[in-house]
């Protein structure tokens, strides 16, 4: 057992069909010595009497707000949350798989910029009862400071039968050197719980790993006279990291007909514009990515050719 | 990158196409490395992120744009120093490169290039015959070290008398190409910066 | 104690459905993920499908995905495993299993394919 | 397809040290605990060792269980008759958990 926060326990179960459970000793915080009971959430009946309690912790129905009184006045709470461990994995009942870019990806994180920021996010299906913390540090051993905000719903989608939720964090690197090459790799670690289930998960990477810059800014169209060829042209997005001759971006410029079965043209270039036939009907899409780095491309920014 | 590239005209920077040509060689050994050696801890999550260069060279600090110099976190240990040398800069007026970043980096691809060669050497001698270190790669090295035309001492190539543990050998080439590409990928961006200039 | 006791074995045609069950007692059934387990005539274990305790998960085997079904109603306390377009290769004592560090089995029920 | 392989068959006399290897990979037995199974002819497996090494109450001291990087074994320290059954170890990848992932097995026969 574990003190996750003030007055707040995890009990770490191993959980199988008809397992012993653990035995806790809960103590009322109090300087009381008499005539001390217990009781579990809202239930007035009476568990034990005295300054301690011993229970023995097996299911859920163990778990819960266990609080001590005296005389119809409240002392102290003590709430027991469950942490499963199933043949030896800690249980994930709360975070949906989102399988992406392996299996057994619960947080996925993405930085637009070298400055030290990134978000992380994460889906479930549960919509009540659920709570979020994380923390986050640059290596393990000796950690080095990631200050993280709140989690909070990011957004609602409707998948099948079920809705989804998606939470989503902001951290910032304390000291962060944009050309720095990291060594130690960044930990994020978000408890979550649900009612009275309490699971961890973490995610560690480096930040050159999770790049993926915004779309290319200004995106424009220049006909060439007498020419089906257009010359195309966009701006670095403002959130990359400068100077730009340093943080070089690379450029993916693709044509692409109304018709998603049509031909895509495609050019590659370290330029902010290139030369290409503009098709009726066609857009003109652009995309960045580190030029030395191949991490992920950023989404695309698009114009029409008309 | 695997992807057709329009590249810009290195010419008057010569440094900067050895750069591109050398963070293209050691992509390939990665990706060579991480697919023969499926078997061995070989990915980024895998590895301990070694430095070899670690407290030898500064080349990060030293070859720090001029506009991230106000950023106190890229600051720690930098040693500023604004005399420019090597043919890399021929005759090109700049204030953002010193002798200090091109020997710097000189020094790291000797570094490297060493331990590179005293590792093919154990390779050559393994009789699963596995993995050797490509001939491009280490001759890339030579070409940008030669475009940098700095003078030091050659460093003798470390010989080893006992028999040498291939699985250890292996996962050391790992960890090596590992931190030679991100260290690439600096010179990369020092390079391009430059060019800029 | 706990105990799982299987049913609805027997002889199939290739191309026919068949539905087997596994009803349990002794525990709180709606607490723990439950596994599919199978055993071909003189062969290996072989792992069919998992459900969560809450039936939100499926999890299946690439040799009975999009055949087999792995479904469970609580308020029965019952495993089952609908077993659609058949195959000789599925002939096999089938096992319920329980999920964790102590596991617990079902009797196992044969499922013989055969035309 | 077993990815976690066993050897077909081992023997032993009455009182002999029998081993039972099961060999893995860094995704499954290198990441995650191993159980040992015994299953007598007819029967469902039973559980001898989980956790690597750590034996269920009712199960005879004889049988012990390890595990070190990517390999785990099974010992019988003196085989008896009532041994003779096939055994398997269970463990999990750590991409397709909770797919139980079984080895080949493995046939104890008991001479003499």
């Known amino acids: 057992i574990w003190e996750l926060k003030k007055d707040v326990y995890v009990v770490e179960l191993d959980w199988y069909p008809d397992a012993p459970g653990e035995m806790v000793v809960l103590t009322c915080d109090t300087p009381e010595e008499d005539g001390i009971t217990w009781t579990l959430d809202q239930s007035s009946e009476v568990l034990g009497s005295g300054k301690t309690l011993t229970i023995q912790v097996k299911e859920f129905g163990d778990a819960g707000q266990y609080t001590c009184h005296k005389g119809g006045e409240v002392l102290s709470h003590s709430l027991l949350l469950l942490h499963k461990k199933e043949d030896g994995i800690w249980s994930t009942d709360i975070l949906k798989d989102q399988k992406e870019p392996k299996n057994k990806t619960f947080l996925r994180c993405e930085a637009k910029n070298y400055s030290g920021r990134f978000t992380c996010w994460w889906l479930t299906t549960i919509s009540t009862d659920l709570t979020f913390s994380v923390k986050s540090s640059r290596g393990s051993s000796d950690p080095q400071g990631v200050t993280c905000g709140a989690a909070t719903l990011s957004a609602e989608r409707v998948r099948g039968d079920n809705k989804e939720y998606e939470y989503s964090v902001e951290c910032q690197e304390d000291s962060a050197c944009p050309a720095a090459e990291e060594s130690l790799p960044i930990e994020v670690m978000v408890d979550a719980v649900h009612k009275l289930k309490y699971e961890n998960y973490t995610s560690s990477f480096f930040i050159r790993d999770i790049i993926k810059p915004d779309p290319p800014k200004n995106l424009q169209l220049k006909p060439l006279k007498n020419s089906r060829q257009v010359e195309v042209s966009w701006e670095y997005p403002d959130t990359w990291s400068t100077p730009h001759s340093y943080f070089s971006l690379t450029f993916c410029v693709q044509v692409q007909g109304k018709s998603k079965r049509e031909k895509k043209d495609r050019v590659f270039t370290d330029k902010t514009s290139a030369t290409v036939i503009c098709r009726k009907n066609a857009s003109i899409s652009v995309r960045a990515q580190d030029r030395y780095y191949s991490s992920s491309w950023s989404e695309w920014a698009s114009v029409p050719c008309s | 990158r695997n992807l057709p590239v329009a590249t810009p005209d290195p010419g008057m920077f010569p440094c900067l196409h050895h750069s591109q040509n050398l963070l293209r060689a050691v992509s390939n050994m990665l990706q060579k490395a991480r697919q023969t050696l499926e078997f061995y801890p070989c990915t980024s999550e895998e590895i301990d992120h070694e430095d070899i260069t670690k407290d030898k060279t500064s080349t990060v600090e030293a070859c720090l744009p001029l506009e991230l110099t106000k950023n106190e976190s890229c600051l720690n240990s930098r040693e500023t120093s604004f005399i420019t040398n090597g043919s890399c800069l021929a005759s090109r007026k700049t204030s953002f490169m010193m002798a200090l970043c091109l020997s710097s980096i000189y020094e790291d691809l000797k570094m490297y290039q060493v331990e590179f060669k005293t590792m093919n050497a154990k390779l050559l001698m393994d009789p699963k015959r596995q993995i050797f270190l490509d001939q491009n790669m280490l001759a890339v090295i030579d070409e940008l070290m030669q475009a940098l035309n700095f003078n030091s001492e050659t460093v003798p190539q470390k010989s080893s008398l006992e028999e040498p543990d291939f699985y250890k050998t292996k996962i050391k080439l790992c960890i090596l190409l590992h931190a030679f590409r991100i260290r690439a990928v600096t010179i990369d961006r020092v390079m391009s910066y430059l060019n800029a200039s | 104690q706990v105990q799982l006791v299987q049913s609805g074995g027997g002889v199939v045609q290739p191309g026919r459905s068949l539905r087997l069950s596994c009803a349990a007692s002794?525990?709180?059934?709606?607490?723990?993920?439950m596994h599919w387990v199978r055993q071909a005539p003189g062969k290996g274990l072989e792992w069919v499908a998992f459900?969560?305790?809450?039936?939100?998960?499926?999890y299946y085997a690439d040799s009975v995905k999009g055949r087999f079904t792995i479904s469970r109603d609580n308020s029965k306390n019952t495993l089952y495993l609908q077993m659609k377009s058949l195959r000789a290769e599925d002939t096999a004592v089938y096992y319920c299993?329980?999920?964790?560090?102590?596991?617990?089995w079902g009797q196992g029920t044969m499922v013989t394919v055969s035309s | 397809s077993y990815v976690l392989t066993q050897p077909p068959s081992v023997s032993g006399t009455p009182g002999q040290r029998v081993t039972i290897s099961c060999s893995g990979g860094r995704s499954n037995i290198g990441s995650n605990t191993v159980k040992w199974y015994q299953q007598l002819p007819g029967t469902a497996p039973k559980l001898l060792i989980y956790y690597n090494d750590q034996r269920p109450s009712g199960v005879p001291d004889r049988f012990s269980g390890s595990k070190s990087g990517t390999s785990a074994s099974l010992a019988i320290t003196g085989v008896q008759a009532e041994d003779e059954a096939d055994y398997y170890c269970?463990?999990?990848?750590?991409?397709?958990?909770?797919?139980?992932?079984f080895g080949t097995g493995t046939k104890v026969t008991v001479l003499g």
């Open positions: 299993k329980t999920h964790g560090s102590h596991d617990n």
């Open positions: 002794g525990f709180t059934f709606s607490e723990y993920g």
């Open positions: 269970q463990s999990y990848d750590r991409y397709t958990h909770p797919a139980l992932l």
């Open positions: 459900i969560r305790y809450d039936g939100s998960n499926k």
